[in-house]
């Protein structure tokens, strides 16, 4: 053990205050009691310590709490949180949403760091599920948070939490994630009337099956093209021309601009050309009249 330098006479810290910003690193190490620091952590964030000084303060806390910091200290870490490694954070047991908010605030405006990802992971695992309040908080700080979760992790989201999700929170979700979220959203919004339901469910429709799209087509919902283009190709293919026309309403004319892109391209290839012609959009590539359409997927299922 290296012999520690003694604190110079008269410099022993009686409280965590701004006088400490003028202490050299070795003076902080020698003159600040770790237990005092732990009880007055809420002051650290208000004092403009240098990064080097924060390193010393972190070291003192690490010595005091080798098994991980208590939540009373974690809640007041402030900018010291930026000094923590994912390994440090894995030792914590964070249960309070207030603590989570306080630490996310420190990282606000930045990309989700490995520290933040570890913190969130620890918090959610500790709670057992991603409840509404937690989801509210996380998506407020990180709109893309939901889409960073695996389908397995998303399965722990209770339907009641879906009310906290905003359309922008789903912007980067892939179809596998929407497959998990859509049934939860359908359950969450099931008691809403037609137009209100569509507004809420719209951003989740990338996970909707064919039968639900057929049902929506009967409700005059006027789906916009941007939403239509995010639908699962396998869910769109079985829709008839009439169903797509009802589903899109006045937006149907947008199909022309998207005829070379999925799922529109694949859908066109499955429709009879004379049915497509009824739209009056000049869509080409449908099945010529007189051709027989075999549903090979059904044939495979029977064999």
């Amino acid at each position: 053990e290296v012999e520690k330098t003694a604190c110079p006479s008269g410099k022993k810290a009686r409280e965590i205050d701004e006088s400490l910003i003028f202490y050299k690193k070795w003076e902080l190490e020698a003159c600040v009691d770790a237990a005092l620091l732990a009880t007055q952590m809420d002051r650290v964030n208000a004092i403009p310590f240098t990064y080097e000084q924060l390193d010393v303060l972190k070291h003192k806390l690490d010595e005091l709490y080798p098994q991980g910091y208590p939540e009373s200290v974690i809640q007041h870490l402030g900018y010291l949180f930026l000094k923590m490694s994912p390994e440090d954070i894995r030792k914590w047991n964070v249960t309070s949403l207030e603590t989570l908010k306080a630490l996310l605030e420190v990282n606000k405006g930045h990309e989700m760091s490995p520290q933040v990802a570890t913190l969130i992971d620890r918090f959610v695992k500790g709670r057992g599920q991603l409840d509404k309040d937690t989801l509210d908080t996380l998506t407020a700080f990180y709109p893309g948070y939901l889409c960073s979760l695996s389908p397995e992790e998303l399965s722990s989201v209770p339907p009641s939490s879906i009310w906290a999700v905003r359309p922008q929170d789903l912007d980067t979700c892939d179809p596998r994630q929407l497959d998990v979220l859509y049934p939860k959203a359908r359950l969450a919004f099931q008691n809403m009337n037609g137009s209100e339901y569509f507004v809420k469910i719209q951003s989740f429709l990338g996970g909707a099956p064919t039968e639900d799209l057929k049902a929506l087509s009967q409700q005059n919902v006027s789906m916009d093209l941007a939403t239509f283009m995010k639908l699962r190709t396998d869910a769109v293919l079985p829709l008839t021309v009439a169903e797509v026309q009802k589903l899109l309403g006045p937006h149907v004319e947008g199909l022309k601009a998207e005829e070379r892109h999925r799922p529109v391209r694949d859908w066109i290839l499955r429709q009879r050309q004379d049915d497509l012609d009824t739209l009056g959009l000049g869509l080409q590539g449908g099945i010529p009249n007189g051709y027989l359409v075999l549903d090979l997927s059904m044939q495979e299922a029977l064999s």
Partner: antibody, heavy 116, light 110 residues
Framework: EVQLLESGGGLVQPGGSLRLSCAAS????????MSWVRQAPGKGLEWVSG????????YYADSVRGRFTVSRDNSKNTLYLQMNSLRAEDTAVYYC?????????WGQGTLVTVSS | QSVLTQPPSASGTPGQRVTISCTGS????????VSWYQQLPGTAPKLLIY???KRPSGVPDRFSGSKSGTSASLAISGLRSEDEADYYC???????????FGGGTKVTVL
Amino acid sequence: EVQLLESGGGLVQPGGSLRLSCAASGFTFSNYAMSWVRQAPGKGLEWVSGIPPNSDSKYYADSVRGRFTVSRDNSKNTLYLQMNSLRAEDTAVYYCAKNMLSFDYWGQGTLVTVSS
Amino acid sequence: QSVLTQPPSASGTPGQRVTISCTGSSSNIGSNAVSWYQQLPGTAPKLLIYYNSKRPSGVPDRFSGSKSGTSASLAISGLRSEDEADYYCGSWDPSLNGYVFGGGTKVTVL
């Protein structure tokens, strides 16, 4: 008990000089930054200058930079403000205060009047 | 013209709650702690709140401070006649390399 006692104020003509002193007691003076704050008659508070414990850097308000000099003598527990080229607008009560980020103790102030 | 902006006056009857705002910028309040000072008539200022929300010993818990973004506020609950004074907010401003005060708020107890 922390005490700060200013002295050196008085009446001086425009262009003249004054040196204010602040005697400190009741705390370890050499550990703390110190500041000067002034208040013109009927006006609000205006920060004038600050100095860290070891005097390695000094801070001034734009209104006094180049004319005022702050210093300290840790062996005498005393803070100073040398004021040169005084102007009428420097007329104020001058307070010395402990710290530089939050002034937890103040002296009673000394009045400086700049007038011909 | 002060760097920090405070309302010139505020008033209330005894027992009421009065709140004083202090608006700054990202270079002062946004990145540094805020303090509040009380100046009774004819006396030196006294520290009321430091580090945004801390009260020095001896300051009644009727006084509370908070900070959010580039603004801070001082609340006085259960207003008393002895609270009639001028109140100043202040913060360090690294861009100016100096301390900045608000213009002060005169609190009157009606």
